[in-house]
Interface confidence: medium
């Protein structure tokens, strides 16, 4: 029988009457046109509604939009428009929250032809109230709050200057003309690129790279020949352009571009790229095209330096810049990650690694599902997760994969059983070991949400017909039951709940059609009346997250440590809470030859856990650039994997000499680098 | 019934060496990590070594690290300690503990007295 | 390495009494704890792990509590069986390491 429908599954008493009494219907009094929902702060409740709305004239197009506020997560909204003098919205630069709980919040608003710049709305306390603010500049992008200090923001203007503010917007000065792009990193550090010869487009390859430390006051050039930049955790990357020909290299910092080295990976050439797919403090994973146009590239993951990296998965599906990957991080467990490779015979298929990108293996069959007709062998097949490539390729999938950081061990998808990815209509597919085993959650696609943190999984059906039924999930997606929140069918746009997924509320988006005209409508379900109790420690038990084998002493060792987590029985229906925190206990493993990747000049044969040297470089001196000089690396092939907590065990040791040689490479040393002020 | 029998104490001399062994019976002793713990004279417990399940990783306190060495052989179910360059302050009863992913030291054996004296 | 202070070294009790002991980690060690006790002439017995797990087996009167660095083992009725010596050892990092050990004597 289909999930949910077992004999053994529990009902939760008297749901339709608790829920009924905590739905709450808004309906807005809007044409439809487009709407945008942000949420401002972290428990406030607060939340932000934007609803545009364009009428097409014939010489222009006239636009409308609305703001509303909600102070309790979406239960009732006040018309604020007036707050904001009823000015048009861009919606194409959303609306700027403030990050943490600063409660700021940036509107930009469109303004006509002839002005001298533009305006926006500024608001400090969680848009009670906003002030109006001419700009010295039209801005060409959303401004940017500093991620230490919220009152410090910048913009690049439609003419390429960058603008920043130390007051929250009340006053901008231009720091910088001719500029490209333009990022924050540490301890309010802007990172930007500059053009000489006319424009980015034109100098491309030939930018340099610049950092302020003291927003604007004094420069520093820290790179030549840039053809873009990146920061990802503790490492600001640049893709440089080489000496002699077309081709650029990427090259890493870890002291804000001070000291650059040449990262161990493949340069590309003009039609290639590279791209950050996830960092931290610990490491990177860096996806490298492959020539020609074939819709695939190679992820490496590098050491904790940047520097060194090891080849982690062949033909990883990425097309062209900017494009699609399926790269996604499983926050729900320590180092699990699912994306995509496109086979020899183009199909696609999905990989997840579980230590961090060290091994990719396929997904698990759910054990109440069939292969279907992708399958060669009826009983030997695999589970594919349908991600953002499939969202392009305009298949039924409304939703990526969801995972939460507090909701342990849980990942949910839609996918197919097969060979490979399936263009039929998919299935919605849990996780609740963080991806090692899968079960089937839901027949057909649908919209999903997970809700205080774990304790509740809520879904609706995605169809193109109206809806107003909505199943909720008290175990972990084992039983559902149906809850129909209006007698009104309504056309669906999307599920809202507040980011951190510690809400016990939902709101449902769509809109009612009538012969004279459609409205916005939102329905808010609060389901703290289904979980009545506050859990209790009975309520939770422990898990050992990457169990594979329960006995074995290294059983849950990843990446050097194991943990242990209280988790909540699927059984018990009780609230975790808002103020739920993950309770987690972890104890360091032996190191293994798995705790260690492969150093320069060394690579892993298929399955093999020990290093060897790369033949072409057998019996040569390794030397490689580190931080604008050349080293002479002795090693006997080993690095330990960043992050990785492993004690005892196997000890490869490793030593470097410095022969302080200059690097004949095309990156900047320290000595070429230059200072200004203004 | 789960068990650990400790083998091969006794007396000797300083700078001499010993061969402990841990018989193991009525579990999977392959997917066990296994300890060696000694209790001094004045009945302070002290870890000395572990050994994963597969027999390739170890780890030593730091007071014999260099001079005692763990192994085992998962085919005849037991755990050994080669003990060289002995000194007085190894002076104890020493006990094989097991080890699983969940559970530390959940089963000991009944230990063997190593004393070290001229 | 991580020190464990265990503390009483000894308490005098009688059956029927509630007896508490604790242990003090040098650093904070999550819940990597367990509790052994050791009889004369037997071999140790594991009571707790996690810090507040009992193993099968173990009557409930034991309970175990804490986080972090500081631990309780608690015995809420002392039965006569539980005359023994209890240790408190820490497994959240190498080298694992041992509380010096609690004496519960006949008053």
């Known amino acids: 029988s289909a999930p949910g429908e077992d004999e053994e599954c529990g009902r939760v008493r008297d749901f339709v009457a608790k829920l009924a009494n905590n739905t709450h219907q808004h309906v807005f009094d809007d044409l439809r046109g487009s709407v945008s929902l942000s949420w401002v702060g972290d428990s406030t409740g607060v939340i932000l509604v934007l609803t545009t709305f364009h009428v097409p004239l014939v010489i222009m197009t006239f636009g409308q939009s609305k703001l509303y506020r909600s102070e309790d997560y979406g239960k009732n909204f006040k018309d604020i428009t007036d707050l904001i003098n009823n000015t048009f919205i861009r919606t194409e630069f959303g609306m700027a929250i403030g990050p943490e709980n600063s409660g700021k919040v940036v509107l930009t608003a469109e303004v006509s032809g002839g002005s001298r710049g533009g305006r926006i709305f500024r608001s400090s306390d969680f848009a009670k109230n906003f002030v109006q603010t001419d700009l010295p500049f039209h801005p060409l992008t959303q401004m940017m709050y500093s991620p230490q200090n919220s009152d410090y923001l910048l913009a690049l203007s439609t003419e390429n200057g960058l603008w920043v503010s130390k007051n929250f917007g009340g006053k901008w000065e231009e720091i910088h003309k001719a500029v490209c792009l333009a990022k924050w990193g540490s301890d309010n550090t802007i990172f930007f690129t500059t053009y000489a010869n006319g424009s980015c487009k034109a100098d491309l390859g030939a930018l340099e790279l610049w950092r302020t430390s003291d927003l604007g006051k004094s420069f520093k050039t820290i790179g030549v020949k840039i053809y873009s930049f990146g920061l990802g955790g503790r490492f600001l990357f640049a893709s440089v352009m080489a000496d002699k020909d077309t081709t650029r290299r990427i090259h890493v910092s870890t002291d804000q571009g001070d000291t650059w080295s040449m990262a161990q990976l493949p340069s590309v050439g003009q039609e290639q790229f590279y791209s950050i797919l996830a960092a931290n403090d610990d490491m990177v994973f860096m996806h490298v095209d492959e020539p020609g146009d074939t819709g695939f590239g190679t992820i490496f993951t590098s050491d904790d330096r940047g520097i060194v990296y090891s080849k982690s998965l062949d033909r990883h599906l990425y097309t062209t810049t900017g494009g699609e990957t399926d790269f996604t991080n499983v926050t729900s467990l320590r180092g699990v990650y699912i994306t995509s490779v496109l086979s020899e015979d183009n199909s696609i298929q999905t990989m997840i690694t579980f230590d961090q990108g060290g091994r990719w293996t396929h997904l698990r069959k759910p054990e109440n599902s069939e292969c279907d007709a992708t399958a060669k062998n009826k009983n030997e097949c695999s589970l594919h997760i349908h991600a953002s490539y499939s969202i392009s390729q305009k298949l039924n999938v409304p939703m990526a994969p969801l995972s939460e950081p507090n909701a342990v061990g849980i990942v949910i998808a839609h996918g197919s059983v097969g060979d490979a990815i399936s263009v039929m209509v998919p299935d919605v597919y849990i996780s609740d070991d963080g991806g090692y085993s899968w079960t089937k959650m839901l027949e057909g696609p649908h919209y999903y949400t997970i809700l205080d943190s774990g304790g509740i999984i809520v879904a609706i059906e995605h169809s193109s017909r109206p809806i107003n039924v909505i199943k909720f999930s008290t175990d972990e997606g084992q039983c559902w039951q149906t809850y129909t929140f209006t007698r009104d069918p309504i056309y669906f746009t999307g599920l809202a709940s507040e980011p951190g997924a510690r809400s016990m509320n939902i709101s449902i988006w769509g809109f009612t059609e009538s012969f004279l005209t459609s409205q916005w409508v939102s329905y808010t379900i609060d389901f703290k009346d289904i979980l009545e109790r506050n859990c209790e420690e009975k309520d939770y038990t422990i898990w050992l997250a990457h169990s594979t084998d329960p006995e074995d002493y290294e059983d849950g060792c990843i990446l050097g440590y194991k943990e242990q987590f209280l988790r909540l029985r699927k059984s018990s229906v009780c609230q975790n809470g808002r103020d739920y925190v993950v309770t987690k206990q972890p104890s360091i493993c032996l190191c293994s030859l798995e705790d260690f990747l492969c150093d320069f000049g060394y690579y892993r044969p298929e399955n093999d856990s020990k290093c060897v040297e790369q033949p072409e470089l057998k019996g040569h001196d390794l030397e490689f650039c580190l931080y604008g000089r050349e080293e002479h690396l002795t090693t006997n092939g080993y690095r330990k994997i960043p992050g990785d907590k492993c004690q005892g065990g196997v000890n490869p040791v490793r030593e470097v000499k410095d022969l302080k040689k200059k690097c004949t490479s095309n990156f900047l040393s320290p000595e070429k680098q230059n200072s200004k002020s203004n | 019934e789960v068990q650990l029998v400790e083998s091969g104490g006794g007396l000797v001399q300083p700078g001499g060496s010993l061969r402990l062994s841990c018989a193991a019976s009525g579990f999977t002793f392959s997917t066990y990590g296994m300890s060696w713990v000694r209790q001094t004279p004045d009945k302070r417990l002290e870890w000395v070594a572990i050994i994963s399940s597969g027999g390739s990783y170890t780890y030593y306190s730091d007071t014999v690290k260099g001079r005692f060495t763990i192994s085992r052989d998962n085919s005849k179910n037991s755990l050994y300690l080669q003990m060289n360059s002995l000194r007085a302050e190894d002076t104890a009863v020493y006990y094989c503990?097991?080890?699983?992913?969940?559970?530390?030291?959940?089963?000991w054996g009944q230990g063997t007295l190593v004393t070290v004296s001229s | 390495d991580i020190q464990m202070t265990q503390s009483p070294s000894s308490v005098s009790a009688s059956v029927g009494d509630r007896v508490t002991i604790t242990c003090h980690a040098s650093?904070?060690?999550?819940?990597?704890i367990g509790w052994l006790q050791q009889k004369p002439g037997k071999a140790f017995k594991g009571l707790i792990y996690h810090g507040t797990n009992l193993k099968d087996g173990v009557p409930s009167r034991f309970s175990g509590s804490g986080s972090g660095a500081d631990f309780t083992l608690t015995i809420s009725s002392l039965q006569p069986e539980d005359f023994a010596t209890y240790f408190c050892v820490q497994y959240a990092q190498f080298p694992y390491t041992f509380g010096q050990g609690t004496k519960v004597e006949k008053r």
């Open positions: 650093q904070g060690i999550s819940s990597n």
């Open positions: 503990s097991r080890s699983s992913s969940h559970w530390y030291f959940d089963v």
